[in-house]
């Protein structure tokens, strides 16, 4: 049994998350994950899910009753999702920590927008003509 | 020229993001994107970057001076990053909108944690033995 299971059960007790009413009104993450089979689509969704759990764990980091459980689960996420790659985890953390209300961050983000957009589609590296074929056509002239 | 370029230039003017000092202290996103070549790694990072921009745009959605620019860029992101797939965009939006301080959301998230963790690694579907090999060995028994 993976080590996170026991620790997740401990968190369930702490949050009363084993109660029957928890399942009311559908799932947060599980139904969404079931929708996406392609690895790249799954990563888009899992990225948001992992950042949610990291924020949740941060809010409870000083609670001694669950500290060990939280740390074990975070370690397991680092192995499974980030392939034990600290650089990947660090880059991810940087992205999740930027403040959207900080005017310097806003200016930088807008400054970088054109280059970010140019890289968004998987075929971004193969030039405009090939990418437009991916969109099944070209953009009409303005 | 892709349509977002003109609109991103308009945003640059609005945010004074063309000023030389904007480049001080490194980039927010570009250096991180340069680090990751694998499509699934890029999606992990781009997922966070796109959610940042969506939050930023939400904060300025009522400003008439940039409304058209913001809407054009959002449409372009939907075509390029979400493949014009509204279900993908809707699932993404649901994930970004969950409140980490809502106790019902916390309980649901903890309730789902074991199953989410079980699916985190790319090889989650190919059985325990194969997956453990992907992690370059097995975990020592507890």
């Amino acid at each position: 049994q993976d080590p996170y299971v026991k620790e997740a059960e401990n968190l369930k007790k702490y949050f009363n998350a084993g109660d029957p009413d928890v399942a009311d009104n559908g799932t947060l993450f599980l139904d969404i994950l079931r929708n996406w089979k392609e690895e790249s689509d799954r990563k888009i969704m899992q990225s948001q899910i992992v950042s949610f759990y990291f924020k949740l764990f941060k809010n409870f980091k000083d609670d001694q009753r669950i500290q060990k459980s939280v740390e074990t689960i975070k370690e397991d996420i680092n192995v499974k999702f980030f392939n034990s790659n600290k650089k990947k985890r660090d880059d991810f953390e940087k992205l999740t920590n930027y403040s959207v209300t900080d005017s310097n961050v806003q200016r930088k983000a807008v400054h970088e927008l054109i280059q970010v957009m140019a890289e968004l589609s998987p075929a971004a590296k193969i030039g405009k003509r090939k990418r437009s074929q991916m969109f099944r056509g070209r953009r009409a002239s303005q | 020229q892709d349509p977002y370029v003109k609109e991103a230039e308009n945003l640059k003017k609005y945010f004074n993001a063309g000023d030389p000092d904007v480049a001080d202290n490194g980039t927010l996103f570009l250096d991180i994107l340069r680090n990751w070549k694998e499509e699934s790694d890029r999606k992990i990072m781009q997922s966070q970057i796109v959610s940042f921009y969506f939050k930023l745009f939400k904060n300025f959605k009522d400003d008439q001076r940039i409304q058209k620019s913001v809407e054009t860029i959002k449409e372009d992101i939907n075509v390029k990053f979400f493949n014009s797939n509204k279900k993908k965009r809707d699932d993404f939006e649901k994930l970004t909108n969950y409140s980490v301080t809502d106790s019902n959301v916390q309980r649901k998230a903890v309730h789902e944690l074991i199953q989410v963790m079980a699916e985190l690694s790319p090889a989650a579907k190919i059985g325990k033995r194969k997956r453990s090999q992907m992690f370059r060995g097995r975990r020592a028994s507890q």
């Epitope: 437009s132 969109f135 | 349509p3 054009t72 449409e75 075509v79 509204k86």
Partner: antibody, heavy 124, light 112 residues
Framework: EVQLVESGGGLVKPGDSLTVSCVAS????????IHWVRQAPGKGLEWVAT????????FYSDSLRGRFTVSRDNANNSVYLHMSSLRGEDTALYYC?????????????????WGRGTLVTVSS | NFMLTQPLSVSGYPGKTIVISCVRS????????VQWFQQRPGSAPAMVIY?????PSGIPDRFSGSVDASSNSASLTISGLKTEDEADYFC??????????FGGGTKLTVLG
């Protein structure tokens, strides 16, 4: 009230070209993707092409790409479908259909609003 | 090649329930929304279900839509069948980037 009105259909010979038009009203036209869908007499529905709203990206059915071109004029609330090298099997009723507003996560449904269609007949 | 396969015809008596299936040949049915359209002779198609299971305003709750990932199919269910429901029904979904796909259509006959 959302309205889409197609025009420009008619009888043409095989090999000829034809442009059909669609004029829209009752909504902010530039916000929405527009689809062209056709229906041959007594047959099912076949998607032809789509053009995005503000960005004007064009998407085509694999079987028609190269012969058909979609374009739009947001200032005049109009979309066009230019068809070249027409064949007998292109004979159909051509519908203009409103798509999503892809900048709005609460957009009205895709393909909710249809025009009445314009009939294109290709025959010698 | 992506296909949405529907039965050619379905029939039922007034007041009964019928189900029209729409099977996706490849790719996951859950990864794209499914819409359903009703088309009466001489009219343009009219949407009866959008985004898997939602009804546009004016469509009675006798019409319902669902998606089943295990069979990779979507279904349109019409309960309390009425003679006015007699029409052709088309499912619709997507593939690739904004590639729209229609099923071949199902002719619904209300018996009696």
């Amino acid at each position: 009230e959302v309205q889409l009105v197609e025009s420009g259909g008619g009888l043409v010979k095989p090999g000829d070209s034809l442009t059909v038009s669609c004029v829209a009203s009752g909504f902010t036209f530039s916000n929405y993707f527009i689809h062209w869908v056709r229906q041959a007499p007594g047959k099912g529905l076949e998607w032809v092409a789509t053009i995005s709203g503000r960005t004007k990206y064009m998407f085509y059915s694999d079987s028609l790409r190269g012969r058909f071109t979609v374009s739009r004029d947001n200032a005049n609330n109009s979309v066009y479908l230019h068809m070249s090298s027409l064949r007998g099997e292109d004979t159909a009723l051509y519908y203009c259909v409103r798509g999503y507003d892809h900048s709005d996560s609460n957009s009205a449904a895709d393909l909710l609003h249809w025009g009445r269609g314009t009939l294109v007949t290709v025959s010698s | 090649n992506f296909m949405l396969t529907q039965p050619l015809s379905v029939s039922g008596y007034p007041g009964k329930t019928i189900v029209i299936s729409c099977v996706r040949s490849s790719g996951s049915v859950a990864s794209h929304y499914v819409q359903w359209f009703q088309q009466r002779p001489g009219s343009a198609p009219a949407m009866v279900i959008y985004e898997d299971s939602h009804r546009p305003s004016g469509i009675p709750d006798r019409f319902s839509g669902s998606v089943d990932a295990s069979s990779n199919s979507a279904s349109l269910t019409i309960s309390g069948l009425k003679t006015e429901d007699e029409a052709d029904y088309f499912c619709q979904s997507y593939y690739g980037n904004n590639q729209v796909l229609f099923g071949g259509g199902t002719k619904l006959t209300v018996l009696g």
